[in-house]
């Protein structure tokens, strides 16, 4: 049911990475706006993005208050210039959103090599631990904040003269690997989360070679 | 139901070449790493290379490398090991796995197998 | 490459006994060491992940351990099902690599 100059909002979507949470929506409106509510399972409605045209919401500062809880979303729509309207029986028209729980569904972002460094045989690649939206005592979590041992990484790297990638893991953000002396090599790193079963590995980072600036050298 | 399915073996001739095929289903091969693993009859197990199917990174032991290519479908959802250049010493039941971490090569499930034999 | 070294090839022990299987790792390898189970005509199951933690479904009389680079294997009680040939394999580099296997026989 509802009014016959709106229509619900259908193929709604989470779109989430590190935790940037956002939820999208068709169709673009013609002659009406949306609303957005959110809750856990177990809470009260909350209203966002109050009657837009957009078709989209940022739900970011709501779950990153407890990225462990389930989310539901719900969008409502309204004809435009006349947001009182409601359906026939009683209520506006909405949709609801898949649910969502941050914590296992978020994406990984594309993770960054911060430096590596090479003593002899022995090369320390680092991670950048990457900041999210996530706050605890008014300060912002890193990745690892969050994740702590469920995140691990994975380190490629590969002879610049050769195409076989060899691999190491971590679950800190560093790694120490042995290298053949005199040559070059070059790495990509990816964030996994093992225990997840979809949503597991991030992007690759992008490549870093040595004989490139983030390199530092140091011959023992 | 999380499985690996191996086909493709058979008989061949040294020199030869052969296809083995891993179809998974029950998961996204491009969420984890596929790794080939071979046992020659009645010896132990010998890693044979991998791939991450998200990047389409490889890397293979020596034993095969430049003969052998591990390539994937991920619109298939499956992973393939081609062979060239056969030799006896080839002969092996060929499993694929799926790894449990990234990359590392710790293994949680694995296809039932399909014997390669090359052989004049 | 690092080379696993297992022992024994091959023991005979009785339903009940306590069953020790070792690896040593040629070089540090950390707690990335698996074990596997692999029964005749079979693919090869995991028992034992990172050295001492044991895979989703298989029995509590399955452990692992690690001290250095030693890595060890224990069956508490051993029961009919467990007569197998049993591998450590490091996963701590590429490539990974197998120990030559443990043939676990009925005495």
């Known amino acids: 049911s509802g009014t016959t100059n709106t229509v619900a909002a259908y193929n709604l979507t989470w779109k989430s990475t590190n935790f940037k949470t956002i939820l999208e929506w068709e169709p673009k409106p013609v002659n009406q706006v949306y609303t957005v509510q959110i809750s856990t399972k177990s809470g009260d409605w909350k209203s966002k993005c109050f009657y837009t045209t957009d078709t989209e919401c940022d739900l970011t500062d709501e779950i990153v208050k407890d990225v462990k809880q389930t989310y539901l979303a719900r969008v409502f729509s309204y004809p435009a210039g006349n947001v009182e309207s409601t359906g026939s029986a009683g209520e506006p028209l909405y949709e609801n959103s898949p649910e969502f729980t941050p914590y296992l569904e978020t994406n990984l972002g594309q993770p960054t090599i911060q430096s590596f460094e090479q003593v002899g045989t022995k090369v320390n690649v680092t991670v950048e631990d990457e900041r999210t939206l996530v706050r605890r005592n008014n300060t912002f979590l890193s990745l690892r904040d969050v994740f702590g041992k469920d995140l691990i990484y994975t380190l490629y790297y590969w002879k610049s003269s050769s195409s076989g990638k060899k691999t190491a893991k971590t679950n800190t953000n560093e790694f120490l690997i042995d290298v053949d002396k005199g040559e070059n090599y070059c790495f990509s790193v990816q964030a996994v989360i093992p225990s997840r079963t979809v949503n597991r590995k991030s992007t690759d980072s992008p490549v870093e070679c040595m004989g490139q600036e983030k390199g530092e050298f140091r011959e023992i | 139901e999380v499985q690996l399915v191996e086909s493709g073996g058979g008989l061949v001739q040294p020199g030869g070449s052969l296809r083995l095929s891993c179809a998974a289903s029950?998961?996204?091969?491009?969420?984890?790493?596929i790794h080939w693993v071979r046992q020659a009859p009645g010896k132990g197990l010998e890693w044979v290379g991998y791939?991450?199917?998200?990047?389409?990174?490889?890397y293979y032991a020596d034993s095969v490398k430049g003969r052998f290519t591990i390539s994937a479908d991920t619109s298939k959802n499956t992973a393939y090991l081609q062979m060239n250049s056969l030799r006896a010493e080839d002969t092996a039941v060929y499993y694929c796995?799926?790894?449990?971490?990234?990359?590392?090569?710790?293994?949680?499930?694995w296809g039932q197998g399909t014997l390669v034999t090359v052989s004049s | 490459d690092i080379q696993m070294t297992q022992s024994p090839s091959s023991l005979s022990a009785s339903v009940g006994d306590r069953v020790t299987i070792t690896c040593r790792a040629s070089q540090d390898v950390n707690t990335a060491v698996a074990w596997y189970q692999q029964k005749p005509g079979k693919a090869p199951k995991l028992l034992i992940y990172s050295a001492s933690f044991l895979y989703s479904g298989v029995p509590s009389r399955f452990s692992g351990s690690r001290s250095g680079t030693d890595f060890t294997l224990t069956i508490s009680s051993l029961q009919p099902e467990d007569f197998a040939t049993y591998y450590c394999q490091q996963h701590y580099t590429t490539p990974p690599t197998f120990g030559q296997g443990t043939k676990v026989e009925i005495k």
């Open positions: 029950g998961f996204t091969i491009s969420d984890y790493t």
């Open positions: 796995a799926r790894d449990i971490q990234s990359v590392s090569g710790e293994f949680d499930y």
């Open positions: 791939i991450d199917p998200s990047n389409g990174y490889t």
